[in-house]
Amino acid sequence: TSHLVKCAEKEKTFCVNGGECFMVKDLSNPSRYLCKCQPGFTGARCTENVPMKVQNQEKAEELYQK
């Protein structure tokens, strides 16, 4: 089984644009990293800009779910 832990200080730069870094701890596989991106960014390392249209759509969906 695997679980997520927050990255150590020295690993945080795996993600860019202020993305929050998590390490996937898995006993049977090497460690790998995931990023939770800031609003406006996407991609494996938060390098991609989300088009404004999509951002607005996401906000609308978020409000609807609330």
Partner: antibody
Framework: EVQLVESGGGLVQPGGSLRLSCAAS????????IHWVRQAPGKGLEWVAA????????NYADSVKGRFTISADTSKNTAYLQMNSLRAEDTAVYYC?????????WGQGTLVTVSS | DIQMTQSPSSLSASVGDRVTITCRAS??????LAWYQQKPGKAPKLLIY???SLESGVPSRFSGSGSGTDFTLTISSLQPEDFATYYC?????????FGQGTKVEIK
């Protein structure tokens, strides 16, 4: 042992094209982030482009956007930089580098000279 | 783009000296700051990343500090092999940008 070997540099006329290669070994290529950085003669370092081989996402410096294309072939563990519409100011040593938490491994560089 | 400004642009020092190089970012880069060493005709070599993390295999005389916009690279006791050019680089946001370099020369 991690190794990055660039090739494809040379002399080209303004407006011409070149394709640089970066052959990688010693690590999981598809799981990394590959960058190209250049250095004009006697000058500092300039970031050029990056690619995530796993999903093909790319990023470019404004100075090369629309002229340069970065790509990767995971079956060959090789990244490429296709350079079109070359200008005199593109003259530089071009390095490829891997990025885990910073640019940790670099190739030896390949010289591109744009001159008539 | 984030501008990176290094100082000094060059310095002369003797073996055994303590050397400090500073780097300032034009906007907040948190702790996403790396330092590289480059010798003539060679590729840059990573020394420090995430502002203060020492890259594997790099001697402990090298250290980094800072966060936000102001950063420092310190060489506690300069060795003959340390004479080189040093670059800072922000790796907080693309495009990644480098300082103009600091050349450390023999006095």
């Amino acid at each position: 042992e991690v190794q990055l070997v660039e090739s494809g540099g040379g002399l080209v006329q303004p407006g011409g094209s070149l394709r640089l290669s970066c052959a990688a070994s010693g690590f999981t290529f598809s799981g990394t982030w590959i960058h190209w950085v250049r250095q004009a003669p006697g000058k500092g370092l300039e970031w050029v482009a990056a690619i995530t081989p796993a999903d093909g996402s790319t990023n470019y410096a404004d100075s090369v956007k629309g002229r340069f294309t970065i790509s990767a072939d995971t079956s060959k563990n090789t990244a490429y930089l296709q350079m079109n519409s070359l200008r005199a100011e593109d003259t530089a040593v071009y390095y490829c580098a891997t990025y885990m938490f910073a640019m940790d491994y670099w190739g030896q560089g390949t010289l591109v000279t744009v001159s008539s | 783009d984030i501008q990176m400004t290094q100082s000094p642009s060059s310095l002369s020092a003797s073996v055994g000296d303590r050397v400090t190089i500073t780097c300032r970012a034009s906007q907040n880069v948190d702790r996403s700051l790396a330092w590289y060493q480059q010798k003539p005709g060679k590729a840059p070599k990573l020394l420090i990343y995430a502002a203060s993390s020492l890259e594997s295999g790099v001697p402990s005389r090298f250290s980094g500090s800072g966060s936000g916009t102001d950063f420092t690279l310190t060489i506690s006791s300069l060795q003959p092999e340390d004479f080189a050019t040093y670059y800072c680089q922000q790796h907080y946001t693309l495009p990644f940008t480098f300082g103009q370099g600091t050349k450390v020369e023999i006095k």
